[in-house]
C-alpha cells in the first residue's frame, strides 16, 4: 500500500482507501469495487455530491467514510445499492442537511456527522431523535440555527415540525357487491413532498382509478367484489420530517353461505364447517330438526386462521364422547341481514346398544336413556379437552 500512487489504493482483501488530495469528484465507477466491504475517502474537496447511481455495484459495502472533503449533498436514495451499509462517517464536510430517506432501510450501527455546518430545520428532526433515543451511535456537533450564536434548538417542541397527518374518508353507507366506492385521502402538514395509494392487496377485487393530487387524493374502486373484504387500502405521504401512512378496509356486504363436511374423529369428534358472509353470519345448529343447545360436551369451536385477510371462517361442531344418542342429522344455519343458508349432514358415532333381535333376551340391567338429549357424550383424548 505504501508504494501505491493511484487515486485509490487497496487495503487488505476488500478495502479501498482514496486519500490523494483533490483527485476525485465522483465515486462512480471505482475500479475493482465489486467485493468492497470498506471504502475510505479523505481530502477530496471536489467530491461535492453523492447521487443515486454513484455506489452502484458496491452491494457488499459495510463501511463508508468520506471525511475532510467537499461533500454538500447526499441524495435521499444514495445508498439504494448498498443495503448492507452499517457504518457511515461523513464528518468534516459541507453538509447543511441530510434527509431521513437517506438512511431509511439501512441498519446503521453508527453515523458520524460532526464537523458539518448542519442547519437546524425540520428536516433534521429525525437526527435529533436518533441522538436523544440512542437509536444507533450518532455523532454530531450541536445543530446550528441561522443566527451566528444559536445553540442546539429543541426541534421537538416546534409544533410545525412533524410528519404529515393522513386521513382516509370512506362512505358511511354499506357497500354491496357491484357498487363503486370512492375513497378520499386527506393529507395535512408542512413541506409536503409526495403521497400515493398502496393497492397491492387489491388485485382482482375491483377496478381502481386514482384521481387528484396533494393535499387530497381520490381513489375509485369500480364494481367491487366480496374479495375486497379484509384487504388493506393504504394511503401514504412524506415530507422532510418523515413518512406517515394509514390503512382502511372496505366492508362489502354479501349473503351468508355455509358448507359442512363429514364427521371426523380427531382427539374428539368434529363436524367440520365453513361459513362465509359479511357481516359475519350468526350460526345455529339443529339436531334432528330441533335446536341443539351447546354444552361443554357439544359446542362450536372456530379454528384459528393464519389468514386474516378473508371473511370465510372454519370450525368444528365439537363432540366430546358422543354415543348412539348423538347419531342423526346435523344442520348448520348461517344468517346475516343479506341472506341465510343451511347445510346438513348425517353423522353416526356409535351403534345403538339397544337395537336387538325381538327373540333376544331384553337387557333389563340397563336403564333406558333419554334419546332426546343432545349433550350426551366416547373417545379418549390426548390433548386437553375444552
Amino acid at each position: 500500500a505504501a508504494s501505491c500512487r493511484e487515486t485509490c489504493c487497496p487495503v487488505g482483501p476488500s478495502g479501498l482507501r482514496c486519500t490523494r488530495a483533490g483527485t476525485l469528484n465522483t465515486l462512480r465507477g471505482l475500479r475493482g469495487a465489486g467485493n468492497l466491504t470498506e471504502l475510505y475517502v479523505e481530502n477530496q474537496r471536489d467530491l461535492q455530491r453523492l447521487e443515486f447511481e454513484d455506489l452502484q455495484g458496491l452491494g457488499e459495502l459495510r463501511s463508508l467514510t468520506i471525511v475532510k472533503s467537499g461533500l454538500r449533498f447526499v441524495a435521499p436514495d444514495a445508498f439504494h445499492f448498498t443495503p448492507r451499509l452499517s457504518h457511515l462517517n461523513l464528518s468534516s464536510n459541507a453538509l447543511e442537511s441530510l434527509s431521513w430517506k437517506t438512511v431509511q432501510g439501512l441498519s446503521l450501527q453508527d453515523l458520524t456527522l460532526s464537523g458539518n455546518p448542519l442547519h437546524c430545520s425540520c428536516a433534521l428532526l429525525w437526527l435529533q431523535r436518533w441522538e436523544q433515543e440512542d437509536l444507533c451511535g450518532v455523532y454530531t456537533q450541536k445543530l446550528q440555527g441561522s443566527g451566528s450564536g444559536d445553540q442546539f434548538l429543541p426541534l421537538g417542541h416546534n409544533n410545525s415540525c412533524g410528519v404529515p397527518s393522513v386521513k382516509i374518508q370512506m362512505p358511511n353507507d354499506s357497500v354491496e357487491v357491484g357498487d363503486d366506492v370512492f375513497l378520499q385521502c386527506q393529507v395535512e402538514g408542512q413541506a409536503l413532498q409526495q403521497a400515493d395509494w398502496i393497492l397491492t392487496e387489491l388485485e382482482g377485487t375491483a377496478t381502481m382509478k386514482k384521481s387528484g393530487d396533494l393535499p387530497s387524493l381520490g381513489l375509485t374502486l369500480v364494481n367491487v367484489t366480496s374479495d375486497l373484504n379484509k384487504k388493506n387500502v393504504t394511503c401514504w405521504a412524506e415530507n422532510d420530517v418523515g413518512r406517515a401512512e394509514v390503512s382502511v378496509q372496505v366492508s362489502v356486504s354479501f349473503p351468508a353461505s355455509v358448507h359442512l363436511g363429514k364427521a371426523v374423529e380427531q382427539h374428539h369428534w368434529c363436524i367440520p364447517f365453513s361459513v362465509d358472509g359479511q357481516p359475519a353470519p350468526s350460526l345455529r345448529w339443529f339436531f334432528n330438526g330441533s335446536v341443539l343447545n351447546e354444552t361443554s360436551f357439544i359446542f362450536t369451536q372456530f379454528l384459528e386462521s393464519a389468514l386474516t385477510n378473508e371473511t370465510m371462517r372454519h370450525g368444528c361442531l365439537r363432540l366430546n364422547q358422543p354415543t348412539h344418542v348423538n347419531n342423526g342429522n346435523y344442520t348448520l344455519l348461517a344468517a346475516n341481514p343479506y341472506g341465510q343458508a343451511a347445510a346438513s349432514i348425517m353423522a353416526a358415532f356409535m351403534d345403538n346398544p339397544f337395537e336387538f333381535n325381538p327373540e333376544d333376551p331384553i337387557p333389563v340391567s340397563f336403564s333406558p336413556v333419554d334419546t332426546n338429549s343432545t349433550s350426551r357424550d366416547p373417545v379418549e383424548k390426548k390433548d386437553e379437552t375444552p
Epitope: S296, F299, Q301, D370, D377, P378, D383
Partner: antibody
C-alpha cells in the same frame, strides 16, 4: 402449567350479592369451558354451571338459574360468578374447574369461602 | 338429571388394608365415570376418569371398574395419604352430578 387462581374468602351480608373470580393461566383461555362447583361445609360437591369463554355461552343446573350468573373477561383471562340474594344456605366454598385431557375435572381452583352473615 | 348414589357414606380402615367404594348411576352412563379424592380444606383431585383410566401421577394401587350403572373404586394396600373423602361423578353430559361422598377414616 395450568392454574386457576381464586381469592381465599368473602364475607357478605344476607340479601347482598358477591362476585367471585377465577383467573386462568397456562393454557388458551378461550378454548376451554370453565365450570363452577359448590361445597357447603362438611357436605358434598354440587355442580352449578359452565361457561364458554370464547362466546360467553352458559349452562346452569336448574336450582342455580336465579342465583348464579357466570361471565367472562377475555382480556384478563378471568371467569366470574355473581351470586345474588345471598342467604346463610349460600355459605360454602365455591370452586372453579376445567377439564383436562378428557371430560373430567383435572384442574381446580383453590376455592373461595363465602360466608353469609349479618 | 342423572343421580349418583355412593356407598358406604363412611368407612374405617387401617394402613395396608384394601377397600372398595361403590357408585350407582340412576341411568346408563356407559363408562363415563370419574373419581376424585379430597382432603380436608383442599380442592378435589382427579384420580380416575372413564371408569378405569388413572389420572396422571395417581399410584397404581387405585383401580376403577364397572360400566352401565354400577361402578367401584378399589384401593389396595392403603397408605396414610389415602385417607380423605372420595367422590364419584358422571361425565356423560350436562348437568354433571356427583355422589354424596365416602369418608375414608383411619381405624
Amino acid at each position: 402449567q395450568v392454574q386457576l387462581q381464586q381469592p381465599g374468602a368473602e364475607l357478605v351480608k344476607p340479601g347482598a350479592s358477591v362476585q367471585l373470580s377465577c383467573k386462568a393461566s397456562g393454557y388458551t383461555f378461550t378454548s376451554y369451558w370453565i365450570h363452577w362447583v359448590k361445597q357447603r361445609p362438611g357436605q358434598g360437591l354440587e355442580w352449578i354451571g359452565e361457561i364458554n369463554p370464547n362466546n360467553g355461552l352458559t349452562n346452569y343446573i336448574e336450582k342455580f338459574k336465579n342465583k348464579a350468573t357466570l361471565t367472562i373477561d377475555k382480556s384478563s383471562n378471568t371467569a366470574y360468578m355473581q351470586l345474588s340474594g345471598l342467604t346463610p344456605e349460600d355459605s360454602a366454598v365455591y370452586y372453579c374447574a376445567k377439564y383436562g385431557n378428557y371430560v373430567a375435572f383435572a384442574y381446580w381452583g383453590q376455592g373461595t369461602l363465602v360466608t353469609v352473615s349479618a | 338429571d342423572i343421580q349418583m348414589t355412593q356407598s358406604p357414606a363412611s368407612l374405617s380402615a387401617s394402613v395396608g388394608d384394601t377397600v372398595t367404594i361403590t357408585c350407582r348411576a340412576s341411568e346408563n352412563i356407559y363408562t363415563y365415570l370419574a373419581w376424585y379424592q379430597q382432603k380436608q380444606g383442599k380442592s378435589p383431585q382427579l384420580l380416575v376418569h372413564n371408569t378405569k383410566t388413572l389420572a396422571e401421577g395417581v399410584p397404581s394401587r387405585f383401580s376403577g371398574s364397572g360400566s352401565g350403572t354400577q361402578f367401584s373404586l378399589k384401593i389396595s394396600s392403603l397408605q396414610p395419604e389415602d385417607f380423605g373423602t372420595y367422590y364419584c361423578q358422571h361425565h356423560y353430559g350436562v348437568p354433571l352430578t356427583f355422589g354424596a361422598g365416602t369418608k375414608l377414616e383411619l381405624k
